[in-house]
Interface confidence: low
């Protein structure tokens, strides 16, 4: 399937609007500090060039690879050295090294200001004045903050963003209409970014075998009526799509994703009865819908797994003949029977089964050796079940904010070397598992909770890799993808940690505290809590609760005072002294 001009091929396949959007996303994810206007200029130049290639595929430079064309364009940015430092050295390289160099410099935590939402009237005016620029700005701002955001999905978010403004800027109460929609898009966008980051980490750090295993388990849960061969085909195609997007090959990724959606909709009968409503939708919505589709009903007559995978005398023969296929079939069969298990648990079970066969198929009596293999699964299944049960009980008892605080204390004691902002961000997100999953019926709790925790802990791993400070974190992040969460759960208080010296500055607060939003106030308090634990890692729950209650009372008192700043100046040192005494 070779084309004289790759850029013309993708332009024709994707259409001008999607082509321009994806190129803007690609450039914004690579050069995260560049101003918007610079990116728009580059995108327009690439688009004009693509059009000349569509008109004549033999025109000069039209036969160049997309990496060559895009890299050449990025390297024309005048301020590359001043803005990006050593990233400018990438431009001295030839392809494919140059593109690899750009990828290496993607920053998961770019030093960019938080996005401030203007007044609704201001946004509506901007939307009406120049809709195209308004939407491009959205793509640019999201892409530069989330350099691994799944690009075709970002186009879907932009379409929803546009629809929200088109509807709400006409409404009687613009704010009431628009703000909840923007909040929903923001929260869904952050979740989508984090999920995709785990997919890219899985591919980049653990190889395509790890990603394929994840995909076999997840797609087998979603499509339990599909044959193994059908699931395998979908897994192969999905792996290609995500490998491309994680490599920055966004045009190919979007094109292949559209092809996969087309294939699924043309083959619904052999995949799932749940696809029908997705397949009537336009492309972006259809692909999103297929990715999020609910699990199909399990076939009623599925036989016991034991016959083929334990009782059969041919287990070792089948395993030896084609190990990965046999293990893939085992994972498929187990996953389609267990929508109530997390994908990570299913992968642990497959790993345990593989380890048993490796040991037993070399034994004198293999069948005798592996006869009890399913019994060995029990503790692996019970561990996440108990974890979910205990944490949901704690969440229901404490509520979200205090549950987050419990996790903050727990994780700071485990890995006190990690930076305070990272501990606050990760623990706040870990704490959101309660509201997200604990209200669900029993059969959906574990897949919701453990697979969400895997996404959040990946964020910790990604941030920690940029600035490694803890051997424990490195160990949990790198040794096994499927055992990351149990590895972190098993960590205890770090006895080797030397407590941080007390710094009064960390616990000095000012009147600006009173004008913060509720969320910002929580973050301030949680930052103080982490610093307290770093100072006194062996403090008891009761001691910490006492200090935090005093803190809340002190802030409330000063925010009600006539002279707020004077109150903070006077009461602050008293609070610090009382806290030190309470933790002594």
């Amino acid at each position: 399937d070779t084309h004289k001009s790759e850029v013309a091929h993708r332009f024709k396949d994707l259409g001008e609007e999607h082509f321009k959007g994806l190129v803007l996303v690609a450039f914004s994810q690579y050069l995260q500090q560049c101003p918007f206007e610079e990116h728009v200029k580059l995108v327009n130049e690439v688009t004009e060039f693509a059009k000349t290639c569509v008109a004549d595929e033999s025109a000069e430079n039209c036969d160049k690879s997309l990496h060559t064309l895009f890299g050449d364009k990025l390297c024309t940015v005048a301020t590359l050295r001043e803005t990006y430092g050593e990233m400018a050295d990438c431009c001295a390289k030839q392809e494919p090294e140059r593109n690899e160099c750009f990828l290496q410099h993607k920053d998961d935590n770019p030093n960019l200001p938080p996005l401030v939402r203007p007044e609704v009237d201001v946004m509506c005016t901007a939307f009406h004045d120049n809709e195209a620029t308004f939407l491009k700005k959205y793509l640019y701002e999201v892409a530069r903050r989330h350099p691994y955001f799944y690009a075709p999905e970002l186009l879907f978010f932009a379409a929803r963003y546009k629809a929200a403004f088109a509807e709400c800027c006409q409404a009687a109460d613009k704010a009431a209409c628009l703000l909840p929609k923007l909040d929903e898009l923001r929260d869904e966008g952050k979740a989508s970014s984090a999920k995709q980051r785990l997919k890219c980490a899985s591919l980049q750090k653990f190889g395509d075998r790890a990603f394929k295993a994840w995909a076999v388990a997840r797609l087998s849960q979603k499509f339990p009526k599909a044959e193994f061969a059908e699931v395998s085909k979908l897994v192969t195609d999905l792996t290609k799509v995500h490998t491309e997007c994680c490599h920055g090959d966004l045009l190919e990724c979007a094109d292949d994703r559209a092809d996969l959606a087309k294939y699924m909709c043309e083959n619904q009968d052999s995949i799932s009865s749940k696809l029908k409503e997705c397949c009537d939708k336009p492309l972006l919505e259809k692909s999103h819908c297929l990715a999020e589709v609910e699990n199909d009903e399990m076939p009623a007559d599925l036989p016991s797994l034991a016959a083929d995978y334990v009782e059969s005398k041919d287990v070792c023969k089948n395993y030896a003949e084609a190990k990965d296929v046999f293990l893939g079939m085992f994972l498929y069969e187990y996953a389609r029977r267990h929508p109530d298990y997390s994908v990570m648990l299913l992968l642990r079970l497959a790993k345990a089964y593989e380890a048993t066969l490796e040991k037993c198929c070399a034994a004198a009596d293999p069948h005798e050796c592996y006869a009890k293999v399913f019994d060995e699964f029990q503790p692996l299944v019970e561990e996440p079940q108990n974890l979910v049960k205990q944490n949901c009980e704690l969440f229901e008892q404490l509520g979200e904010y205090k549950f987050q605080n419990a996790l903050l204390v727990r994780y700071t004691k485990k890995v006190p070397q990690v930076s305070t902002p990272t501990l606050v961000e990760v623990s706040r997100n870990l704490g959101k598992v309660g509201a997200k999953c604990c209200k669900l019926p029993e059969a959906k709790r574990m897949p919701c909770a453990e697979d969400y925790l895997s996404v959040v802990l990946n964020r910790l791993c990604v941030l920690h890799e940029k600035t490694p400070v803890s051997e424990k974190v490195t160990k949990c992040c790198t040794e096994s993808l499927v055992n990351r969460r149990p590895c972190f759960s098993a960590l205890e208080l770090d006895e080797a940690y030397v407590p941080k010296a007390f710094n009064a500055e960390t616990f000095t607060f000012h009147a600006d505290m009173c004008t913060l939003s509720e969320k910002e106030k929580q973050v301030k308090k949680q930052t103080a809590l982490v610093e307290l634990v770093k100072h006194k890692p062996k403090a008891t729950k009761e001691q910490l609760k006492g200090v935090m209650d005093n803190f809340a009372a002190f802030v409330e008192k000063c925010c009600k005072a006539d002279d707020k700043e004077a109150c903070f100046a006077e009461e602050g040192p008293k609070f610090v002294a009382a806290s030190q005494a309470a933790l002594a």
Partner: nanobody, 116 residues
């Protein structure tokens, strides 16, 4: 299209040395950890060694530790395996693969035979 082409194998006497190379193309080599795995006649795949994307973190199976050295040249998109003090039990087809210890080979491999 992801391509991994292994080379450098051959017949060598016990105690001898070989250097295997793996030329990678079609993906962002610099951004990925890489591994060597091997398959002895009639056996399954056995992980040999891994190296992270930057090249500073290397891991080895107990059977080759101290004898084999994994390295990479990101500028040349190439992965290497220096094999010293070879033993007859090192006889296998050697494959390079994208990722860590669980990586799946996709190339043709290169045959290493250790025999007197």
């Amino acid at each position: 299209q992801v391509q991994l082409v292994e080379s450098g194998g051959g017949l060598v006497q016990p105690g001898g040395s070989l250097r295997l190379s793996c030329a990678a193309s079609g993906f962002t080599f610099r951004g990925f950890g890489m591994s060597w795995v091997r398959q002895a006649p009639g056996k399954g795949f056995e992980w040999v060694s891994s190296i992270n994307s930057g090249g500073e973190d290397t891991r080895y199976s107990d059977s080759v530790k101290g004898r084999f050295t994994i390295s990479r040249d990101n500028a040349r998109n190439t992965l290497y395996l220096q094999m010293n003090s070879l033993k007859p039990e090192d006889t296998a087809v050697y494959y390079c693969a994208i990722g860590g210890a669980g990586a799946t080979p996709s190339g043709q491999g290169t045959q290493v035979t250790v025999s007197s």
